[in-house]
Amino acid sequence: AVNGTSRFTCFYNSRANISCVWSQDGALQDTSCQVHAWPDRRRWNQTCELLPVSQASWACNLILGTPDSQKLTAVDIVTLRVMCREGVRWRMMAIQDFKPFENLRLMAPISLQVVHVETHRCNISWKISQASHYFERHLEFEARTLSPGHTWEEAPLMTLKQKQEWICLETLTPDTQYEFQVRVKPLQGEFTTWSPWSQPLAFRTKPAALGKDT
């Protein structure tokens, strides 16, 4: 038998993916478990196999359709269950009535690129990926720049309170290597959280012109 404290957390990427993590203290590592998704008003259902990510937690992705298809709407409620095999039977370990657009985590921004770089500033753009058209412009971004000799955790956060897919970094040091990351979050959703950080974009500022003050 499996007992102990259970935690079952899922997020919708706003298009065609629900990612879930289930953690259970005292769970058996070799138990076969799945997440089952049953929307309240749709003809389809979906299952994914939970795979271990640590000693007592498992994760899986419910793929609902092609990446950019709008598979759930603002009024859908999805019953999500963790089912684990016990011999020849399946036992329900966790259940939740999941409101997709109250539990959002978008994909990390992609296609980061340097639009223009100078000695002291750099203009960077990016794109959002697999984000619903539902949000219109009601998204916010956080960005951070990694300076030499510092860690990402030390980097101050810059907040963009609107759907602005570019930033102009100022007061940079000439001829210096930097890295840049950005993440996105919709305003919608009580339990919505930030996307993962984008892949870092490395760039170098231009050297100061010789014989000029910098």
């Epitope: 709008q70 603002a74 009024v75 058209h133 539902y134 009601h138």
Partner: antibody
């Protein structure tokens, strides 16, 4: 500039059907939801439903779903709302609006429908 | 269906003064509450989303707040163009529903 331009006022007899159009401009029609809202004198604002032009999916409020049909013509960037089996309490101003599912960012000018025998 | 109750039905305030409009939900709606302004003969106009987020182009004198199921729209210093009817709207449970409106009139 975002604009939603609705068809003109209608006078209908009880039991008839009315169809109102909403021509949109200033944004990508295929990337948007068009909603319909009723504002009747004694009842206030009531959400009727919406259509998602990206995939043609509709959502109707329970109080209207038996009588309302929302459609969209992506070739002309026009949404339509058809209300059947009209009764006197359907006398109202009907608005189309653009927005995500949760709130209405831009509104049409409204279409007055009078139901009278 | 969630019932949205606005109070007062009519509010009389002098220009330059502060106006406080209330909207209460019949059940918990998180921050899924939006405010609109409607002037006679016009369509409603979106002012505030998610309880407190201002829409671009809306003057800074309009602000929103939340305490549990009670939401407040505050207009800090009333201008002549602010006298109108104000509606709240919830988007927590379908069908989305509106309050009956508060008419803000000149005192």
């Amino acid at each position: 500039e975002v604009q939603l331009v609705q068809s003109g006022a209608e006078v209908k007899k009880p039991g008839a059907t009315v169809k109102i159009s909403c021509k949109v401009s200033g944004f990508n029609f295929k990337d948007s939801l068009v909603h319909w809202v009723q504002q009747a004198p004694g009842k206030g604002l009531e959400w009727m439903g919406w259509i998602d032009s990206e995939n043609g999916e509709t959502e109707y409020a329970p109080g209207f779903q038996d009588r309302v049909t929302i459609t969209a013509d992506t070739s002309t960037d026009t949404a339509y709302m058809e209300l059947s089996s009209l009764r006197s309490e359907d006398t109202a101003v009907y608005y189309c609006a653009r927005g995500g599912p949760w709130f209405l960012s831009y509104w049409g000018q409204g279409t007055t429908v009078t139901v009278s025998s | 269906e969630i019932v949205m109750t606005q109070s007062p039905a009519t509010l009389s305030v002098s220009p330059g003064e502060r106006a406080t409009l209330s909207c209460r939900a019949s059940q918990i709606i998180s921050n899924n509450l939006h405010w609109y302004q409607q002037k006679p003969g016009q369509a409603p106009r979106l002012l505030i989303i998610y309880g407190l987020q201002s829409i671009s182009g809306i003057p800074a004198r309009f602000s929103g707040s939340r305490s549990g199921t009670e939401f407040t729209l505050t207009i800090s210093s009333l201008q002549s163009e602010d006298f109108a009817v104000y509606f709240c709207q919830q988007s927590n449970n379908w069908p989305w529903t509106f309050g009956q409106g508060t008419k803000l009139e000149i005192k």
